[in-house]
């Protein structure tokens, strides 16, 4: 809609709004140590932070969700910070026949928005 | 990942987990009454509810997000309930040159998952 404009400046202060953050995780953290062989530590970019009114709205649905949350906060949740895109990562893992490399296209977030 | 399975049964009880809900909204509610002419009331399906561990996980990222949230709840947020797909809706609206019909493909949610 031309009548609701998403905004990119965070009204809550630096680092408070929806953004990408890197989280270090071991294979043990993920419960993957029995089948993933490498890498043994992953840098997992994740989407964190709040989604104040109209901030980084993903689409028209998110814009109206923000609007209706303002009117009916108990009924309609605020938009939340989720990945808008991913970056691929290759894992080496154990298979029945040995070892293989597999690319995961949906594991590490590359960008975030409010949906 | 073959080692983390999303689940579809809600451990929190009926209606508590991520699901689609219809919210009635007027053009006035949306602040659209000055430019949208019809329909004057919209049925806006929205995604509401909680995302307990592994419930309706959108992808590998959501699965590991759920896992890491269990380990570092202050650092990593739980997955949240967002649209997985949309259904189109046609709006008649005012334009500079008169009236036009436009299909919005991202306004009404059709399915939900935890991302």
């Amino acid at each position: 809609s031309a009548h609701l404009h998403p905004r990119d400046s965070c009204p809550l202060g630096p680092g408070r709004c929806c953004h990408l953050e890197t989280v270090q995780a071991t294979l043990e953290d993920l419960g993957w140590s029995d089948w993933v062989l490498s890498p043994r530590q992953l840098q997992l970019s994740m989407c964190v932070g709040e989604c104040p009114h109209l901030y980084r709205s993903a689409n028209t649905h998110a814009l109206i969700k923000a609007r209706l949350h303002g009117l009916q906060p108990d009924r309609v949740p605020a938009p939340c910070c989720v990945p808008s895109s991913y970056t691929p990562v290759v894992l080496m893992h154990r298979t029945d026949s040995g070892v293989s490399l597999q690319t995961y296209d949906d594991l590490v977030a590359q960008g975030c928005h409010c949906a | 990942s073959a080692h983390l399975h999303p689940r579809d049964s809600c451990p929190l009880g009926p209606g508590r987990c991520c699901h689609l809900e219809t919210v009635q909204a007027t053009l006035e509610d949306l602040g659209w009454s000055d430019w949208v002419l019809s329909p004057r009331q919209l049925q806006l399906s929205m995604c509401v509810g909680e995302c307990p561990h592994l419930y309706r996980s959108a992808n590998t990222h959501a699965l590991i997000k759920a896992r890491l949230h269990g380990l570092q709840p202050d650092r990593v947020p739980a997955p949240c309930c967002v649209p997985s797909s949309y259904t189109p809706v046609v709006l008649m609206h005012r334009t500079d040159s008169g009236v036009s019909l436009q299909t919005y493909d991202d306004l009404v949610a059709q399915g939900c998952h935890c991302a």
Epitope: - | T22, S38, P39, R40, Q41, M92, L101, Y104, V108, Q110
Partner: antibody
Framework: QVQLVQSGAEVKKPGSSVKVSCKAS????????ISWARQAPGQGLEWMGG????????NYAQKFQGRVTITADESTSTAYMELSSLRSEDTAVYYC???????????WGQGTMVTVSS | DIVMTQSPLSLPVTPGEPASISCRSS???????????LDWYLQKPGQSPQLLIY???NRASGVPDRFSGSGSGTDFTLKISRVEAEDVGVYYC?????????FGGGTKVEIK
């Protein structure tokens, strides 16, 4: 160009129900609302109700409230109008039409003749 | 319910001549957004209705420019600048301001 194709003519007994279907051929409902209207023999048009995306709840004319149910199945691009407790006055041609809300009914089905007779 | 009244009931016309149909509503169809929630439909013999005009004065896609709609509030007019043989049928006005949607009784246009 989308066409709305309705189910065939029906002959029903008083007190029974009829369910008329309306399928979008050559496409889907594509985000349009679906209205239902009827036309008794030699008479004008009468609006019964309608349903807008996501086709969850319908809006009915008070006259038919409790007797009519309008539904739509997006997966098959088919809308339905069910009228219960039929009486002879319900004998009419029933039409579905797509619109933007209840306005701008730009594509109509060919009509379904429903005859109520004992 | 909003009552829609059309006149005349029947309109004999000569091809090439203009024709005019009136539609009155029992309450104003002018919305606060400045648009009149009134459509005009033509039902040709043995056919389903077809949309001619929406929102009082907007011609629907594919409708010849000899058809025009005018009026505001409670008084509306459909004009055919030069009637053609294919224009015969019953013309209906319809209000979409509030449910139930209501139609006028119809005006039958026939060739003299």
């Amino acid at each position: 160009q989308v066409q709305l194709v309705q189910s065939g003519a029906e002959v029903k007994k008083p007190g029974s129900s009829v369910k008329v279907s309306c399928k979008a051929s050559g496409g889907t409902f594509q985000g349009y609302a679906i209205s239902w209207a009827r036309q008794a023999p030699g008479q004008g048009l009468e609006w019964m109700g309608g349903i807008i995306p996501p086709y969850a709840t319908a809006n009915y004319a008070q006259k038919f409230q409790g007797r009519v149910t309008i539904t739509a199945d997006e997966s098959t691009s088919t809308a339905y109008m069910e009228l219960s407790s039929l009486r002879s006055e319900d004998t009419a041609v029933y039409y579905c039409a797509r619109g933007v809300g209840e306005l701008h009914l730009d594509v109509w089905g060919q009509g379904t003749m429903v005859t109520v007779s004992s | 319910d909003i009552v829609m009244t059309q006149s005349p009931l029947s309109l004999p016309v000569t091809p090439g001549e203009p024709a005019s149909i009136s539609c009155r509503s029992s309450q104003s169809l002018l919305h606060s957004n400045g648009y009149n929630y009134l459509d005009w439909y033509l039902q040709k013999p043995g056919q389903s209705p077809q949309l001619l005009i929406y929102l009082g004065s907007n011609r629907a896609s594919g409708v010849p420019d000899r058809f025009s709609g005018s009026g505001s509030g409670t008084d509306f007019t459909l004009k055919i600048s030069r009637v053609e043989a294919e224009d015969v049928g019953v013309y209906y006005c319809m209000q979409a301001l509030q449910t139930p949607i209501t139609f006028g009784g119809g005006t039958k246009v026939e060739i003299k």
